[in-house]
């Protein structure tokens, strides 16, 4: 969660619906400063890969974790509530060794039924010794890990390895690939939206299915609503992230899960190991694949992906570079939309979603992703905004 | 301003085919799906199918498929619908309507009235 | 394929507050039918009014709003004017190709 709008000064923090600068102290104070109210409705989120649940604090002006004394599901729930999750996604909640935290919030039981972030003041102590931890929704687990494969010039992938890849069609064709992150909404690209094809009602989402060829009229999933990221822009790439609402939740099974969003603290390194996949072209200016393929990619630093000799400053903080720098190893066309994932702790974490390249796994052309990590706060108000 | 221009009347035979146009004007022709749309008489309306400006993709109301066929011609930024083995029940207006940001029927052409007589 | 149903006829006055309905065959309207309205006047000119339930084309008075009440979708006029003597058409997505209604004919006395 961002709270340094770019329109504020670095100590304001901005309302989304008027654009107005508010003090970091009004913020989660228990009163709405913004018009949308939101200054009151982000005051959660889940930090690291443990998802350890922090409350802001208005009088410390930062975050901090929640103790576990007194806690229960029911806190739980409500915390992931406000953060833009249904009450039936909800999976468990869980206690982590506070790993040396000196600053908590603590629930104040006596405060009686009022609102969770009411009953929550400032300690420096946890009797407890631990805080808690909260899962959402059962993200980020797959059946099997996919065998080394390429989607430029390689083998399929396994079923239920990547059981949150959608194929996104208009007119019973393959356009673009998505990332199932709840029941009701997808993950996909900017791009793959534009003019003409911002109107919901062309678009068709396949989930659970690896083949092209299996996935026809009655078999989809029609989409309700399509959501492009305020400040894309078509011409760089830049925020190039988009939302689709399905008109029905899908039902998850093996072949079908959510990958987990990543939360802030989750740090990337260098060369760290991902997975692309999709139903792109297993060839530069080739047709789209029938079997959906999978590959590993390594990380690339943002500084390198930028030199002269790769993309010469046209990767913002908003992208990730990913691949081979020698090539070989690449999303295509038809790929876009889709996942760029990595493990952490035994979760799949959606670190990027296909983007751009100069051309398909050419040697200093990486592919680039949206960076994820960035519009994790815009994915949760689109979330919580349609209640 | 949004201008959709569609060609003259037609007197066709039964049989024969006939090809109708809709000329756009007044904004990016790339960025928006046409429709198409017939009107019988009285005052039912029917969608027939869209195109996309963009690559020619189509969809169409399976009751028109192998009766109608859409086209684009970029360049002119004009949209065709070819109606072909006409009879009688096909004499009826035919409009040209562009979609819009959520609305699929937001700019119409004045229509085209087709007449099939021998 | 549905059949899309309107009312075929209202009148209303100069003023009134009048609401025009289109159901569906196969079940409620719902926010995935994308409920639109068309008007058409009588030199047979059409215009879009509603789009996507309840979003009011460029250049439409704010008199003219969609909603979806109970298991249909409707076009309200509050305080209707005798320039809204038309032919309102609705139209309703079924996954893959739209159907119109039949039309409602509005006559403002």
């Known amino acids: 969660w961002k709270f340094m709008g770019s329109k504020c000064s670095n100590s304001g923090i901005e309302c989304d619906s008027s654009g107005t600068c508010i003090n970091p102290s009004n913020w989660c104070d228990g009163v709405s400063h913004c018009p949308g109210g939101e200054d009151e409705n982000r005051c959660v989120r889940l930090y690291g890969p443990n998802f350890i649940l922090q409350v802001y604090s208005s009088q410390r002006k930062s975050w901090h974790p929640v103790c576990q004394d007194d806690w229960n599901e029911n806190y739980g729930r409500a915390a992931c509530r406000d953060m833009g999750y249904k009450n039936n996604f909800y999976s468990s909640q869980g206690i982590v060794d506070d790993s040396g935290s000196t600053s908590f919030m603590k629930l104040n039981t006596s405060a009686g039924n009022v609102d969770i972030y009411k009953k929550l003041y400032h300690s420096d102590a946890c009797s407890s010794k631990a805080v808690v931890s909260l899962r959402c929704i059962a993200c980020g687990v797959n059946l099997n890990s996919s065998r080394q494969s390429r989607i430029v010039g390689g083998e399929s992938a396994l079923p239920g390895a990547w059981p949150w890849q959608v194929s996104l069609h208009v007119q019973n064709v393959h356009v673009c690939g998505g990332s199932i992150i709840t029941p009701e909404w997808i993950v996909t690209a900017a791009h793959c939206v534009e003019k003409p094809l911002n109107n919901p009602w062309h678009w068709t989402a396949f989930a659970g299915i690896l083949r092209q060829s299996f996935m026809f009229y009655g078999a989809g999933y029609q989409v309700e609503k399509v959501i492009s990221h305020p400040n894309y822009d078509s011409k760089t790439k830049n925020n190039d992230i988009a939302l689709m609402k399905l008109q029905k939740p899908l039902t998850f099974n093996d072949l079908v899960k959510p990958v987990c969003l990543p939360n802030p603290g989750m740090m990337l390194q260098p060369e760290q190991l991902c997975w692309i996949s999709g139903w792109g072209a297993t060839e530069e200016k080739g047709k789209t694949s029938e079997v959906l393929n999978a590959a590993k990619v390594l990380l690339i630093e943002t500084q390198r992906c930028n030199s002269r000799y790769v993309y010469d400053n046209l990767i913002t903080p908003a992208m990730i570079c990913a691949g081979f720098l020698q090539g070989n190893v690449d999303s295509c066309q038809g790929d876009s939309g889709g996942p760029l994932v990595t493990s952490k702790n035994n979760i799949w974490w959606l670190i990027g979603d296909t983007s751009w390249g100069s051309g398909c796994a050419k040697a200093y052309r990486p592919g680039v992703y949206g960076n994820v990590m960035v519009f994790t706060d815009w994915i949760y108000r689109q979330m919580r905004a349609d209640g | 301003e949004v201008q959709l221009q569609q060609s003259g009347p037609e007197l066709v035979k039964p049989g024969a085919s006939v090809k109708i146009s809709c000329k756009a004007s007044?904004?990016?022709?790339?960025?928006?799906?046409m429709n198409w749309v017939k009107r019988r008489h009285g005052k039912s309306l029917e969608w027939i199918g869209n195109i996309n400006p963009n690559n020619g993709g189509t969809s169409y109301n399976q009751k028109f498929k192998g009766k109608a066929t859409l086209t684009v011609d970029k360049s002119s930024s004009t949209a065709y619908m070819e109606l072909r083995s006409l009879t009688s029940e096909d004499s009826v207006v035919y409009y040209c309507?562009?979609?819009?940001?959520?609305?699929?029927?937001?700019?119409w052409g004045q229509g085209t009235l087709v007449t099939v007589s021998a | 394929q549905a059949v899309v149903t309107q009312e075929s006829a209202l009148t209303t006055s100069p003023g009134e507050t009048v609401t025009l309905t289109c159901r569906s065959s196969i079940g409620t309207v719902t926010t995935s039918n994308f409920a639109n309205w068309v008007q058409e006047k009588p030199d047979h000119l059409f215009t879009g009014l509603i789009g996507?339930?309840?979003n009011r084309a460029p250049g439409v008075p704010a008199r003219f709003s969609g909603s979806l009440i109970g298991d249909k979708a409707a076009l309200t006029i509050t305080g209707a004017q005798t320039e809204d003597e038309a032919i309102y058409f609705c139209a309703l997505w079924f996954s893959n190709h739209w159907v119109f209604g039949g039309g409602t004919k509005l006559t403002v006395l």
């Open positions: 007044g904004y990016t022709f790339t960025d928006y799906y």
């Open positions: 309507a562009r979609e819009g940001d959520l609305f699929p029927f937001a700019y």
């Open positions: 996507a339930s309840n």
